[in-house]
């Protein structure tokens, strides 16, 4: 039977235990918020908030400035002092709930859990490549704020998301806060609001528009705001909330809320349910139709996509897509299927679906029984009626009231369940060349950088490495600064290159030079690296062949052996066709003549595994000595492949030339009819790849082969006679003169 090269798993070409050290900053406490700034004069900064403190870092993550944001009531609180002499409210620690840039000024705005959730504005003062914060301004006017009406009460201790939008000369803060009965009773924060920053930075203009969970639902209906972003003409909030006001509050789902970014009003507030599922290629018995639902959004990010993913999503390259990581429930641990799935929602499609939903509600003829929804924000009503009213009045428009679109937007896991046990806790998507890369942080403190592509049954990793030794979860919010992403884990901020932390996790030259161009990987003799790591020997254009195994491990000194070589970078072409004169194999001093590929033996090799085979005929030279020697494969003048050309030599020891010796044959006679079981004894009888016992020139069928013994069944004899018996190994006769006597049956 033909010997076949063992498959090498694809994973063997990389090592995700390789340690990478990326720049980091120890903040001195659990990182609560982080935002980056890049100015137009090459100045940049990272702002990092922990309890009671705000750090300003340079682009190198070195501390530039530090500001005390608490505790409230403490004389050392610098932001509190900006509000003038106190007291301003109950004393206590300040946990930063909001940290955003107002791009118009530019300025940094921070809002904390203390002092009724008020905010502070810090002008950015770029000096050289560094950025400093000016003295803080207190965005709170005591005489404008009351417990029942507080335009300057922004942050909720339960969590707040803010997106700042410039409209004309004004900055509008789109604010979404989680509420409960206790929070709602204290200085009346709102669930969703749009607030204009006053020109004199003394707070927010009164009379702002808002939606809030109705008092009767506050106890049972809580909305978590997971992410907010601004793209095109809209601001979007992503929420996790109970699927129904009336049913089980623990049955959660994910919604997208859309607000106009051009008009500071909430009449066109729209919500849409986002449905993300895992639909395995082969459905298990009893598995739900359409796939297993993953209703709870954990993290999200929107980004323009590269060409390849755009094609798969049937959209144009560069279009904005919302990516979300979903889990099955709040605890994130499902019974079956992966822990995390990733779904992609093109923004244009979301908008189209919302707009169609508005038409369904408001167009004639009326769709009976179609609800306006959002009963936690407004009185129940049926389309096209406004909330709480039986009918439209002549001067109101159906379109000028908030609406839950009746249909949901369903998508399936881009990764096809391949994230498996990984619990993703952070997500940022970038477009590199025409590739779309998901940069994901995990529950156990790792960073996964993976190409977002739908059509494969394995993950295409840029990298997969541990941020540090703490193993603490990577936090939800990720920021970009130039060509780096900033991830927070525990009390540390880490700076990760979007191109990946390095190339050392690629173990083979072939894998190294097949890496994405943007990674800048090259081969350095025996490791994969970036040019700065090994400037002398670094190259990106060729790989030597790599021998990993061969068969057999021994061959006869006289006679030929069919040698099978295993490894990688033999051909670069799936057909395995070798141009004349490119591959030279020597075993010891002896050449091994390349054999043409037997096309009937070509097997498709899945990308998850890889191995290349090369066969040659070994004919030892007369000068070849008995004993151990090396197998050497040299490839030259090969036409280049897609990523590199093969060029170089690979040597593997462990082949031995041996001289088979035949010592005894028994029995020396047998019936003319044949079938006598002959036993040939000797040494090195199993070397090489072919052997034959000839009785009067006819092959004696081999039943067993070992190093010291051959068993075969004699062929029938023509007549009763003594006939020559010989052993050939590799086509050459083993010395010795033996006869076998055919007798009458």
């Amino acid at each position: 039977e033909d010997w076949q090269c063992p498959r090498t798993p694809y994973a063997a070409s990389r090592d995700f235990d390789v340690k990478y050290v990326v720049p980091s900053f120890s903040a001195g406490g659990l990182v609560q918020a982080m935002v980056t700034y890049e100015g137009d004069r090459n100045e940049s900064a990272v702002f990092v908030a922990i309890r009671n403190r705000l750090h300003v870092l340079g682009p190198d993550l070195k501390s530039v400035q530090s500001l005390a944001t608490g505790p409230a009531g403490d004389p050392g609180c610098q932001t509190c002092a900006a509000c003038g002499p106190g007291p301003h409210g109950p004393p206590g620690d300040t946990d930063t709930k909001v940290l955003v840039l107002d791009p118009a000024l530019p300025a940094l705005v921070s809002c904390g859990s203390s002092l009724q959730g008020r905010c502070f504005l810090h002008d950015l003062e770029p000096q050289g490549t560094a950025v400093h914060l000016a003295a803080p301004a207190c965005l709170f006017s005591a005489h404008h704020n009351r417990p029942d009406d507080c335009p300057d009460c922004v942050a909720s201790p339960l969590g707040t998301r803010v997106t700042v939008v410039e409209q004309g000369q004004a900055s509008y803060f789109y604010v979404a806060s989680s509420l409960d009965a206790a929070v709602a009773a204290s200085f009346s924060p709102r669930s969703v609001s749009i607030r204009r920053l006053k020109a004199d930075a003394s707070g927010f203009a009164p009379g702002f528009v808002a939606l809030s969970v109705l008092p009767k639902h506050l106890v049972s209906y809580s909305i978590e705001y997971v992410h907010s972003f601004h793209t095109g003409a809209f601001v979007y909030f992503l929420t996790v909330q109970p699927a129904s006001v009336t049913d089980d509050p623990s049955a959660l789902h994910t919604r997208l809320a859309r607000l106009s970014a051009t008009e500071p009003e909430l009449g066109d507030y729209r919500e849409l349910v986002l449905d993300c599922r895992f639909a395995p290629k082969r459905r298990r018995r009893g598995a739900p139709e359409g796939g297993q639902p993953y209703p709870v959004l954990r993290v999200a990010h929107s980004a323009p996509v590269g060409a390849q993913l755009a094609t798969e999503l049937s959209i144009a390259e560069g279009q904005e897509v919302l990516f979300g990581v979903f889990v099955t429930g709040k605890d994130g641990g499902p019974g079956v299927g992966p822990n995390s799935v990733v779904c992609a929602f093109p923004i244009d499609l979301l908008d189209t679906l919302i707009d169609e939903g508005v038409e369904r509600c408001c167009e004639s003829p009326v769709h009976p029984g179609l609800r306006r929804g959002l009963d936690f924000f407004q009185s129940p009503s049926f389309c096209p009626n406004p909330p709480g009213l039986e009918a439209l009045s002549p001067n109101t428009s159906c379109r000028h009231f908030p609406l839950l679109v009746s249909s949901s937007f369903s998508r399936v896991d881009l990764f096809n369940g391949l994230l498996g046990p990984v619990q993703v806790t952070a997500l940022y998507v970038t477009r590199l060349d025409n590739v779309t890369v998901a940069h994901m942080g995990t529950m156990d403190g790792r960073i996964l950088q993976v190409e977002l592509v739908r059509s494969l049954n394995y993950l295409l990793y840029v990298s997969n490495f541990s941020l540090g030794d703490s193993g603490q979860p990577v936090q939800r919010d990720v920021s970009r600064l130039g060509d780096h992403l900033l991830f927070a884990s525990g009390d540390q901020v880490f700076q990760v290159p979007i191109q990946g932390p390095g190339c050392r996790h690629f173990l083979t030259c072939g894998r190294c030079l097949r890496a994405w161009h943007f990674m800048g990987c090259g081969w350095c003799g025996n490791m994969c690296g970036q040019q700065k790591e090994c400037p002398g020997s670094w190259q990106q254009d060729h790989c030597p062949p790599k021998l990993t195994e061969f068969h057999p491990h021994s061959g006869p000194l006289r006679g030929s052996t069919r040698l099978t070589l295993c490894g990688s970078n033999f051909y670069l072409h799936p057909s395995g066709l070798v141009p004349e004169g490119t591959h030279q194999v020597t075993v010891g001093q002896s050449p091994c003549r390349p054999l043409p590929k037997d096309s009937s033996k070509l097997r498709p090799v899945p990308r998850k595994d890889f191995v290349e085979e090369f066969e040659c005929e070994l004919e030892p030279l007369g000068t070849q000595a008995v004993g151990p020697t090396n197998v050497s494969l040299t490839v030259t003048n090969m036409p280049p492949g897609k990523h590199f050309r093969v060029d170089g030599t690979s040597v593997l020891r462990g082949f031995s030339f041996m001289e088979p010796v035949l010592i005894a044959v028994q029995p020396l006679f047998g019936p003319r009819a044949g079938g006598t079981c002959l036993t040939l004894e000797g040494q090195s009888l199993s070397v090489g790849t072919s052997r034959a016992v000839l009785v009067n020139g006819t092959e004696c069928l081999l039943a067993r082969v070992s190093e010291g013994q051959l068993l075969c069944a004699t062929p029938p004899g023509a007549t009763v006679a003594s006939v020559p018996l010989s052993l050939q190994v590799g086509g050459a006769q083993v010395p010795g003169s033996w006869t076998f006597q055919y007798r009458e049956d």
């Epitope: 004389p75 610098q78 900006a82 000024l105 530019p106 003062e125 000096q127 400093h132 003295a135 930075a201």
Partner: antibody, heavy 117, light 108 residues
């Protein structure tokens, strides 16, 4: 090189008004916080007022709050101090100074304001 | 308000001697937010030290700052004739910004 030149000082009667100007050159004016500091004859330094680079934040010493207004025009690289309801105790040399987090690293030569009847 | 108290009010020393000036705050000042200034008669103040211990541009190495919390020190390791002047500390940690009353270093 960095230069700050104050102007607008002079003699004024109690209850009167003056507007001080500080012309800045040699640096990116709209990247720096600015302050006014005064020094009464034979006395120490007293901080008067502060304005952040984009005018978002202004602060005043209690002694001048409600009477003085600090402002800036970044397009003209000029800092102002509008002084109303002047009193005899406002008599001093008024300096404009650049900076906040790295201290007040550059000062003008000062302009004298005398409030007297 | 944070009150800064400088001592001594006057320091009489000879050229070449070491001068140690003290500034005490009524409440803690983060070391990032304290400066020292030198002023000569008829001239504007000049920044010597910012962030309690960082020398400003062009300031000779004989000037050094130290301290944290409520106690800060300006040291002139060896007085030069041009160093005889009045020295002020200033906090810019919290509004209102405040100066110490000054220490006059005079020739003995």
């Amino acid at each position: 090189q960095v230069q700050l030149v104050e102007s607008g000082g002079g003699l004024v009667q109690p209850g009167g008004s003056l507007r001080l100007s500080c012309a800045a050159s040699g640096f990116t004016f709209n990247s720096y916080s600015m302050s006014w500091v005064r020094q009464a004859p034979g006395k120490g330094l007293e901080w008067v007022s502060y304005i952040s680079s984009r005018s978002s934040t202004t602060y005043y010493a209690d002694s001048v709050k409600g009477r003085f207004t600090i402002s800036r025009d970044n397009s003209k690289n000029t800092l102002y101090l509008q002084m109303n309801s002047l009193r005899a105790e406002d008599t001093a040399v008024y300096y404009c100074a650049r900076g906040y987090f790295h201290g007040m690293d550059y000062w003008g030569q000062g302009t004298l304001v005398t409030v007297s009847s | 308000d944070i009150v800064l108290t400088q001592s001594p009010a006057t320091l009489s020393l000879s050229p070449g001697e070491r001068a140690t000036l003290s500034c005490r705050a009524s409440q803690s000042v983060s070391f990032d937010y304290l400066g020292w200034y030198q002023q000569k008669p008829g001239q504007a103040p000049r920044l010597l030290i910012y962030g309690a211990s960082n020398r400003a541009t062009g300031v000779p190495a004989r000037f050094s700052g130290s301290g944290s919390g409520t106690d800060f020190t300006l040291t002139i390791s060896s007085l030069e004739p041009e160093d005889f002047a009045t020295y002020y500390c200033q906090q810019y940690y919290n509004m209102p910004y405040t100066f110490g009353q000054g220490t006059k270093v005079e020739i003995k």
